[in-house]
């Protein structure tokens, strides 16, 4: 079966919907096709375009009950079940390499229906807060995707650096100094699509002292003692997508 040739025979696009979908790494994701009954279909095709890889195609032809794959090497990306029973695609589990564009093409006798997903894999950064010099604190959000945002309460004299890693994650480092001596406690607030986290630390007056915030260095999902952290679940933690029709 040459699914490309057949798709071209029915190249009229009757409807196309594209959605951006942020999804947490290590969760399971299910991507859905348009709501069209199998009885109306000739071919179902999933096109998967991942960065730096040839386009992968998974196709099912109803007439022959035949499935075919082209350039598909990732065994974590599969049909949810037999395509004649469920045309959805699943990624179990989502890895950082699954960033890309996924499109379901449903070929009917009258034209095609497309449902596309721009999948953005989210990686929760590891957050640490410590004091490295007199009245200077360093807050780091390590290996997050996308880059986390760091803010301080109260505001200080701050410098922020970003370090980009080859796997697409970013480490954000914010170093702040407070000249005002009545500031004794500072809070680092890390905002990220996977959730938000706040750490605070008491500034030591002793020169050269190094002090870590309690619980610093743990992941965003951890619960910390003494309520030094506030955890707010972000919008990116859902396994399934709410569809827009």
């Amino acid at each position: 079966m040459d699914e490309k040739q057949i798709t071209q025979n029915y190249s009229k696009v009757l409807a196309e919907v594209n959605t951006s979908w942020p999804v947490k790494m290590a969760t399971n994701a299910v991507l859905c096709c348009p709501p069209i009954a199998l009885r109306n279909l000739i071919i179902i095709t999933w096109e998967i375009i991942l960065r730096g890889q040839p386009s992968c195609t998974k196709a099912y032809r109803k007439e022959t009950n035949e499935t075919k794959e082209t350039n598909c090497t990732d065994e974590r990306i599969t049909w949810v079940s037999r395509p004649d029973q469920n045309s959805d695609l699943q990624i179990r589990p989502v890895a950082i390499t699954h960033d890309g564009y996924y499109r379901c093409i449903m070929v009917t006798p009258d034209g095609n229906f497309h449902r596309g997903y721009h999948l953005q894999v989210l990686v929760t950064p590891e957050v640490t807060l410590f004091q490295n010099r007199n009245r200077t604190a360093v807050c780091k959000a390590v290996a997050g995707k996308p880059a986390a945002q760091i803010s301080w309460i109260p505001e200080g004299d701050c410098a922020t650096k970003q370090e980009y890693w080859s796997n697409g994650t970013v480490t954000v480092k914010s170093t702040c100094h407070w000249e005002v001596h009545n500031v004794s406690t500072v809070t680092c607030h890390v905002s990220h699509l996977t959730g938000n986290k706040s750490l605070y630390i008491e500034l030591l007056p002793v020169p050269g002292a190094k002090k870590s915030a309690k619980g610093g260095g743990s992941g965003l999902n951890d619960i910390f003692e003494a309520q030094k952290i506030e955890w707010h679940e972000g919008s990116g933690g859902h396994h399934h997508h709410h569809h827009h029709h």
Epitope: L14, A15, V30, C32, C33, P34, P35, I36, A37, R39, N40, E63, N86, S87, D88, T108, P109, D110, F113, H240, H241, H242, H243, H245
Partner: antibody, heavy 119, light 110 residues
Framework: EVQLVQSGAEVKKPGASVKVSCKAS????????MFWVRQAPGQRLEWIGY????????KYNEKFKGRATLTSDKSASTAYMELSSLRSEDTAVYYC????????????WGQGTLVTVSS | DIQLTQSPSSLSASVGDRVTITCRAS??????????MHWYQQKPGKPPKLLIY???NLESGVPSRFSGSGSGTDFTLTISSLQPEDFATYYC????????FGGGTKVEIK
């Protein structure tokens, strides 16, 4: 404009057969599945079956299997529903309805054909 | 087979009233991110007319006073302000694999 025009009313005796036609226009007949639905007086709508003129696939409600036969004439863009061994409880209005792809919904219906079964 | 139970079976209302009709399925009609529930209006001697598809989508040309909601097994059709032409019978319908209709709700003039 999509139109589904059904044949006229029929009066039949118990045990007889009836064949209702549904002529489609305004679209490519073979591209869409045609459903048949009936409505007895004061009753809910009831699915009889469907035919896909693209490949002649048919599916029937278990209740009508063996009594209902769905066919189509592609050259005439017409779907047919034949019901045999008629009984009085088959007295109903019979509708054809085109299934639209997205959501499997029925936007276009025939006007209905009243079939009366009476001795 | 999925059974659809509509309530109430009939109701009396006045022009301008807000009307709510419910439909309960014997098992979930939601799959793959979509709810396969549609709503139709039928007047005597006429075929049904599609109002709402996939639970909440307004069919083209249908007045915005009609709305649908729900997922899983429980669905609702709402008419925000009943108009004289809205007195009719309303049916919910599921059509994923097998086609099923609810028993209907007749909306009458009070």
């Amino acid at each position: 404009e999509v139109q589904l025009v059904q044949s006229g009313a029929e009066v039949k005796k118990p045990g007889a057969s009836v064949k209702v036609s549904c002529k489609a226009s305004g679209y490519t007949f073979t591209s869409y599945v045609m459903f048949w639905v009936r409505q007895a007086p004061g009753q809910r709508l009831e699915w009889i079956g469907y035919i896909n003129p693209y490949n002649d696939d048919t599916k029937y409600n278990e209740k009508f299997k063996g009594r209902a036969t769905l066919t189509s004439d592609k050259s005439a863009s017409t779907a047919y529903m034949e019901l045999s061994s008629l009984r009085s409880e088959d007295t109903a209005v019979y509708y054809c309805a085109r299934e639209d792809y997205y959501g499997s919904r029925f936007v276009y219906w025939g006007q209905g054909t009243l079939v009366t079964v009476s001795s | 087979d999925i059974q659809l139970t509509q309530s109430p079976s009939s109701l009396s209302a006045s022009v301008g009233d807000r009307v709510t009709i419910t439909c309960r399925a014997s098992k979930s009609v939601s799959t793959s991110g979509y709810s396969y529930m549609h709503w139709y209006q039928q007047k005597p001697g006429k075929p049904p007319k599609l109002l709402i598809y996939l639970a909440s989508n307004l069919e083209s040309g249908v007045p915005s006073r009609f709305s649908g909601s729900g997922s899983g097994t429980d669905f609702t059709l709402t008419i925000s302000s009943l108009q004289p032409e809205d007195f009719a019978t309303y049916y919910c319908q599921h059509n994923r694999e097998l086609l099923t209709f609810g028993g209907g709700t007749k909306v009458e003039i009070k």
